[in-house]
């Protein structure tokens, strides 16, 4: 065997070894990448598990709180079951009173009678809070509503049904304030303002009575 042949064989062998080395390096690199990827996904899985565990813990706490609230509500319902409602059906409860907005249009005297038949009186405004509530309640409507305020003639004071006088700081009565009518002058509320008019006119009205706020 000649030296040149030996040299060629060595060169060929070296090329094979280089190729195998590169192949092995590629495999090692791929395995390392796979291992790294596996580690990453393992880490991701760990994070997901931790997150899920945390959320599950939170939900368990929420469920526990809701359970306690449910128990409390059941207790409250048991107590309420032994009490009557503060207002009859169709009446609106606000503060210490119940209010009913009439569905029929009548003169002031008839409106008063309708309220009396329901064990109530026509609306009486005692405070700015009462006025605010009524203004809010009738804001959807453009209709006039009789209230329990009237006077015999302009030389007399405005009086509520119970005989108490109108507190001047609450509101100013507008409209037919200087008028005298055989049927008297009565007050109605419309769009938040209070007007005086002939009690003989037919209008809607607001009845009012004390709310039942005591346990039986």
């Amino acid at each position: 065997m000649q030296l040149s042949q030996v040299s060629d064989l060595l060169t060929q062998e070296q090329a094979n070894l280089t190729h195998q080395k590169k192949k092995l390096e590629g495999q090692i690199s791929a395995r390392q990448q796979a291992e790294e990827a596996s580690q990453e996904s393992e880490n991701e899985l760990k994070e997901m598990i931790e997150t899920l565990a945390r959320k599950l813990n939170e939900k368990s706490k929420e469920q526990m709180e809701l359970h306690h609230q449910n128990l409390n509500l059941q207790e409250t319902l048991k107590r309420v079951a032994n009490c009557s409602a503060p207002c009859p059906q169709d009446w609106i409860w606000h503060g210490e009173n119940c209010y009913l907005f009439s569905s029929g249009s009548f003169n002031w005297e008839k409106s008063q009678e309708k309220c009396l038949s329901l064990d109530a009186k026509l609306l009486k405004i005692n405070s700015t809070a009462d006025l605010d509530f009524i203004q809010q309640a009738i804001s959807y409507s453009s209709f006039p509503f009789w209230m329990g305020l009237s006077r015999r003639n302009p030389s007399y004071p405005w009086l509520w049904e119970d005989g108490s006088p109108l507190m001047p700081h609450l509101f100013r009565v507008r409209g037919a304030v200087s008028q005298t009518y055989p049927s008297g002058t009565c007050a109605y509320i419309q769009r938040g303002a209070v007007y005086a008019e002939n009690c003989i006119l037919a209008a809607f009205s607001i009845c009012q009575k004390k709310a039942n706020l005591r346990a039986q």
Epitope: R174, A193, A196, E197, N198
Partner: antibody
């Protein structure tokens, strides 16, 4: 001083429409009820309609119900009468009048505007 | 469709007293006040009497109003030539929910 000034009258064909206005001055407009009253030539006074301070109470004479619409704009101190489906018998001088109460007396009147319904 | 009834005409000599009647029902004059208006030829009506018997400022005291039951009347004393005019009574009818006028009375000063 109190002033009521009607406008919008004129000649209109039967079935036609017209809108009358009454401009007010010299008083607090929203504190008064307002009426339309008409007077046919050589005839007496005929009440047409009334509107309360904020329009909560509105009433019409049977002869115009469903055809005429009264309204007011308190921000403009103006009263209106929208007249539709006009008939020959609606021919009259139309007055606007002020009342301190819806059912009380008319203490001030405008000079009137003539509406003639004819073909 | 006149609800309040007035005589179509009345007359009197200067200085005399005349009355104009106005008849209604329980749903108008019987339960509400009566007003009276004077309308001089070619002019708008003018308030003469309100709330049955009250005279607005500027109206002479020769004019007076009264009411009894379902009827009202306007009295003019010391009749003057310038009183020649049409006079209308007016009330509110609560049953029909409308203003009602009388047909008017023509006063002639002889």
């Amino acid at each position: 001083q109190v002033q009521l000034l009607e406008s919008g009258g004129g000649l209109v064909q039967p079935g036609g429409s017209l809108r009358l206005s009454c401009a007010a001055s010299g008083f607090t407009f929203s504190d008064y009820a307002l009426h339309w009253v008409r007077q046919a030539p050589g005839k007496g006074l005929e009440w047409v309609s009334v509107i309360s301070y904020q329009g909560g109470f509105i009433y019409y004479a049977d002869s115009v119900k469903g055809r005429f619409t009264i309204s007011r704009d308190n921000s403009k101190n103006t009263l209106y009468l929208q007249m539709n489906s006009l008939r020959a018998e609606d021919t009259a001088v139309y007055y606007c009048a002020r009342s301190p109460g819806l059912t009380s007396y008319h203490d001030s009147w405008g000079q009137g505007t003539l509406v003639t319904v004819s073909s | 469709d006149i609800v309040l009834t007035q005589p179509p005409s009345v007359s009197g000599a200067p200085g005399q007293r005349v009355t104009i009647s106005c008849s209604g029902s329980s749903s108008n004059i019987g339960s509400n006040y009566v007003s009276w208006y004077q309308q001089l030829p070619g002019t708008a009506p003018k308030l003469l009497i309100h709330s049955n018997s009250h005279r607005p400022s500027g109206v002479p005291d020769r004019f007076s109003g009264s009411k009894s039951g379902t009827s009202a009347s306007l009295a003019i004393t010391g009749l003057q030539a310038e009183d020649e005019a049409d006079y209308y009574c007016q009330s509110w009818d609560y049953e029909s929910e409308r203003v009602v006028f009388g047909g008017g009375t023509k006063l002639t000063v002889l």
